[in-house]
Interface confidence: low
């Protein structure tokens, strides 16, 4: 015998209190699959979280983070504070990268500058807190008449204005 609840589509639940009639999910709840006996409560995006996608009767709300924070964890379960380029987030807030390290993003940790000498190359452009060093050609590559090397302009995220 077929379970009458299997006929209840997404966005409804099988209401045992009403002879297993398919009832619409109440406000602020959803069912993403058919045959559900309950609807799930919608996620609320509040405080540091903001709504990326509203909850509907068939799908949960999706959150992202308010400006100044970025998502961490599956489904943006956490928001972590942004730092400026040239900084990393520690337990005591945003701290400048130590000498010899850099961070070109608003999240993540400071990483050591590239050691050009390991590849037998020279430093063409010194590193900063925000940028890695640019390695130049190895001395052997610098034969007479070789074309000069122009360092690349620092990359910038589209639409990103420095903080």
């Amino acid at each position: 015998l077929q379970d009458p609840c299997s006929n209840c589509p997404a966005g409804t639940f099988c209401d045992n209190n009403r002879n297993q009639i398919c009832s619409p999910c109440p406000p602020n709840s959803f069912s993403s699959a058919g045959g559900q006996r309950t609807c799930d409560i919608c996620r609320q995006c509040k405080g540091v979280f903001r709504t990326r996608k509203e909850c509907s009767s068939t799908s949960n709300a999706e959150c992202d983070c308010t400006p100044g924070f970025h998502c961490l964890g599956a489904g943006c379960s956490m928001c972590e504070q942004d730092c400026k380029q040239g900084q990393e987030l520690t337990k005591k807030g945003c701290k400048d990268c130590c000498f010899g390290t850099f961070n070109d993003q608003k999240r993540g940790i400071c990483r050591p500058w590239t050691n050009c000498s390991l590849d037998g190359k020279s430093v063409l452009v010194n590193g900063t807190k925000e940028r890695d060093v640019v390695c130049g050609p190895s001395p052997a590559d610098l034969s007479p008449g070789a074309s000069s090397v122009t360092p690349p302009a620092p990359a910038r995220e589209p639409g990103h204005s420095p903080q």
């Epitope: 405080g47 972590e80 337990k91």
Partner: nanobody, 124 residues
Framework: EVQLLESGGGLVQPGGSLRLSCAAS????????MSWGRQAPGKGLEWVSA????????YYADSVKGRFTISRDNSKNTLYLHMNSLRAEDTAVYYC?????????????????WGQGTTVTVSS
């Protein structure tokens, strides 16, 4: 259900003081670091201050250091933010937040539950 309810906001003149409170329920308050954040009109949310579960460690954003003091009363399940020498740029909605994971160590930025906020307006 975890709940955080802020209060104590209002209108205050520049140079004035306010004390914000955050009443917590639904979890073991003393096991969690707590934080205050704020959102000025038209701006992103800014982290303001944090305190470890025991109250032994406190942290402040540079913008409020020396003017704001965070504290907690674990017997009352309440978090406080004492704000002195208030400036126009302190005008914002202030939120309290609970750390996601109970820790005995220092503050982390994994805040999972935020209150509804209380509005502070600094104006003459």
């Amino acid at each position: 259900e975890v709940q955080l309810l802020e209060s104590g906001g209002g209108l205050v003149q520049p140079g004035g003081s306010l004390r914000l409170s955050c009443a917590a329920s639904g979890f073991t308050f003393s096991s969690y670091a707590m934080s205050w954040g704020r959102q000025a009109p038209g701006k992103g949310l800014e982290w303001v201050s944090a305190i470890s579960g025991s109250g032994g460690s406190t942290y402040y954003a540079d913008s409020v250091k020396g003017r704001f003091t965070i504290s907690r009363d674990n017997s009352k399940n309440t978090l406080y933010l004492h704000m002195n020498s208030l400036r126009a740029e302190d005008t914002a909605v202030y939120y309290c937040a609970k750390e996601k994971v109970a820790t005995t160590g220092d503050y982390y930025y994994d805040m999972d539950v935020w209150g509804q906020g209380t509005t502070v307006t600094v104006s003459s």
